[in-house]
Amino acid sequence: QPDAINAPVTCCYNFTNRKISVQRLASYRRITSSKCPKEAVIFKTIVAKEICADPKQKWVQDSMDHLDKQTQTPKT
């Protein structure tokens, strides 16, 4: 889970070791703050949980691409 040490900076200290299906993902945000020990991606899931993931992993990159395409495609 993400950890907000001194709001508004949220950092990730551990990454999930389990792939999450894109069907369970709602959005994401990147963590690039120099105040954090590592770069990370925080996925917000459809069940409101936030999960820290490693941006170097392929499934994480693929999931971000998928979510980017979803937001670019207008709902008709």
Epitope: I20, Q23, T45
Partner: antibody, heavy 119, light 109 residues
């Protein structure tokens, strides 16, 4: 260690309702979902529905839509399954089981509650 | 809904033999969101395998899962007396509903 403890066996008349409880201990109740699964005598497992308190989601299998209500009380870490308009075919063992809403495998199960519907 | 079909319905084997149980889905179970459970008479099911191939905590190494898409397999490398039970597969990529297979009974020959 996570434990799910269900309420005791029930004998009900056709047309009535039954409410089964499932009290969780040893975990963060609101971070997980509770599924309800039933098993008629000598039959397989049948998923009835689920509740995910964190997200406020409740899902029901189409077969039980309108007849089942699943609720949760976070203050007591207890989930409930109410089944109405009971018929003899509803005689079964009813299980609650915990799942992580991001995934869905049922990692901890209650001991089961036998509901007998008989006139 | 995704329909899961397990085969065979019953498997008659002796202790020490290898058991291979099949679970076939009516449509692709993406991301291998499939689990296997063991159920003994009078007991609640017990999670054995999740994500098609990951063993749950405390599950012996003789149990292994494999497969993707529509075809999944549970293998018990060498049957122990306590392994004779009913085994169910379950998909959790779509909910509602999570669906179960009809079960495979592994009995002593």
């Amino acid at each position: 260690q996570v434990e799910l403890v269900q309420s005791g066996a029930e004998v009900k008349k056709p047309g009535s309702s039954v409410k089964v409880s499932c009290k969780a201990s040893g975990g963060t109740f609101s971070s997980y979902g509770i599924s309800w699964v039933r098993q008629a005598p000598g039959q397989g497992l049948e998923w009835m529905g689920a509740i995910n308190p964190l997200a406020g989601h409740t899902h029901y299998a189409q077969k039980f839509q309108g007849r089942v209500t699943i609720t949760a009380d976070e203050s007591t870490s207890t989930a409930y399954m109410e089944l109405s308009s009971l018929r003899s075919e509803d005689t079964a063992v009813y299980y609650c089981a915990r799942y992580d809403g991001i995934y869905g495998e049922l990692d901890f199960w209650g001991q089961g509650t036998l509901v007998t519907v008989s006139s | 809904d995704i329909v899961l079909t397990q085969s065979p319905a019953t498997l008659s084997l002796s202790p020490g033999e290898r058991a291979t149980l099949s679970c076939r889905a009516s449509q692709s179970v993406s991301d291998a969101y499939l689990a296997w459970y063991q159920q003994k008479p009078g007991q609640a099911p017990r999670l054995l395998i999740y994500d098609a191939s990951s063993r749950a905590t405390g599950v012996p190494a003789r149990f292994s899962g494999s497969g993707s898409g529509t075809d999944f397999t549970l293998t018990i490398s060498s049957l122990e007396p306590e392994d004779f039970a009913v085994y169910y597969c379950q998909q959790y990529i779509t909910y509602p509903p999570f669906t179960f297979g009809q079960g495979t009974k592994v009995e002593i020959k």
